[in-house]
């Protein structure tokens, strides 16, 4: 595999990670796929410092992150442990609200206008943030 030592064009470096901030909206799954095709993942927030960095760049706009509970428990897309990790939910969130009338509950997490987190319907077209770590060998599978 090859090692990424600097961030791609149009990405922002911060604390040995690269971040890319969309300026348009997609459903959570489509945003997730977009990041994967960039050899990245939806942003995983592991500290208050990283929260403030992301919040500064996205402004007061609903923005997807790499956290969901579509299969039951809350999970970060990169495998970071949810239970012991950083959290910044709004009061009384997540609430898996069913009252939106769109069917089902709320299984995907996003930054709200004040930066704190809320769970929402995964189909909503929110902006998103991709993240990839520097100095991490990219997975290049062997050819068949």
């Amino acid at each position: 595999g090859s090692e990424r030592t600097c961030c791609p064009v149009n990405w922002v470096e911060h604390e040995r990670s690269c971040y890319w901030f969309s300026r348009s909206g997609k459903a959570w799954a489509d945003a997730d796929n977009y990041c994967r095709l960039e050899d990245a993942h939806l942003v995983v927030v592991t500290s208050w410092e990283e929260q403030k960095f992301v919040q500064h760049h996205i402004g007061p706009v609903n923005t997807w992150m790499g956290l969901h509970d579509q299969n039951g428990p809350w999970k970060w897309v990169d495998g970071t442990d949810y239970e012991t990790g950083f959290k910044n939910w709004r009061p009384e969130q997540p609430d898996d609200w069913y009252g939106h009338g769109l069917g089902g509950g709320e299984d995907c997490a996003h930054f709200t206008d004040d930066g704190r987190w809320n769970d929402d319907v995964c189909q909503r077209p929110y902006r998103w943030v991709c993240e990839t770590e520097l100095d991490k060998a990219s997975q290049e599978p062997p050819l068949l």
Partner: antibody
């Protein structure tokens, strides 16, 4: 000059296999996701598969999932499509295409190869 | 998957005519819409990306518009080299990218 050149097409019997190649030049191959798109004779365009720049992430259209495998060798600037369990309905021109992304989060296939014909027939 | 429907499927026009091709998405795709031109026996060629942005080298007689589910490709003054098949493609829900069935522009 940015260029994509496919090869490996031909006539194959139903149930058979074929491996297509796409040689890239004129751009930093490993920095771009690459895709295969096909076109059956006299028909429209159908997206087949895509692979991220490192090769670590792959996606497939429903009609080929489980039968086709996309891969790449960045040291050779080459994209591959391994096609197994071929069916008559896989008969098409297969194009490789470079995926370009734009500032705000959209993408498009901005460079296409000339295509290679795959015919599945007994 | 999001379905893309183009109309008309074919049209006849003369050099100098203004031509409109429409594309409708089965769900809102914001402005994640691309247009391609394909000449007989050739590979497709990107014309317009993200609804209205002209790909480098594409003549200014081509333009795109629309938002949500309804989009239009306009050729302001048809030229001989514009006789081809045109495809729209959504990149909102991608993968899978999906294309319209194509619109063939023929000489009247």
């Amino acid at each position: 000059e940015v260029q994509l050149l496919e090869s490996g097409g031909g006539l194959v019997q139903p149930g058979g296999s074929l491996r297509l190649s796409c040689a890239a030049s004129g751009f930093t191959f490993s920095s771009y996701a690459m895709s295969w798109v096909r076109q059956a004779p006299g028909k429209g365009l159908e997206w087949v598969s895509v692979i991220s720049g490192s090769g670590g992430n792959t996606f497939y259209g429903d009609s080929v999932k489980g039968r086709f495998t996309i891969s790449r060798d960045n040291s050779k600037n080459t994209l591959y499509l391994q096609m197994n369990s071929l069916r008559a309905e896989d008969t098409a021109i297969y194009y490789c295409a470079k995926r370009e992304t734009y500032d705000w989060g959209s993408d498009a296939f901005d460079i296409w190869g000339q295509g290679t014909m795959v015919t599945v027939s007994s | 998957d999001i379905q893309m429907t183009q109309s008309p499927s074919s049209l006849s026009a003369s050099v100098g005519d203004r031509v409109n091709i429409t594309c409708r998405a089965s769900h809102s795709i914001s402005n994640y819409l691309n247009w391609y031109q394909q000449k007989a026996g050739k590979a497709p060629n990107l014309l317009i990306y993200t609804t209205l942005n002209l790909q480098s080298g594409v003549p200014s007689r081509f333009s795109g518009s629309g938002s949500g589910t309804d989009f239009t490709l306009t050729i302001s003054s048809l030229q001989p080299e514009d006789f081809a098949t045109y495809y729209c493609q959504q990149s909102y829900s991608s993968p899978p990218w999906t294309f319209g069935q194509g619109t063939k522009v023929e000489i009247k």
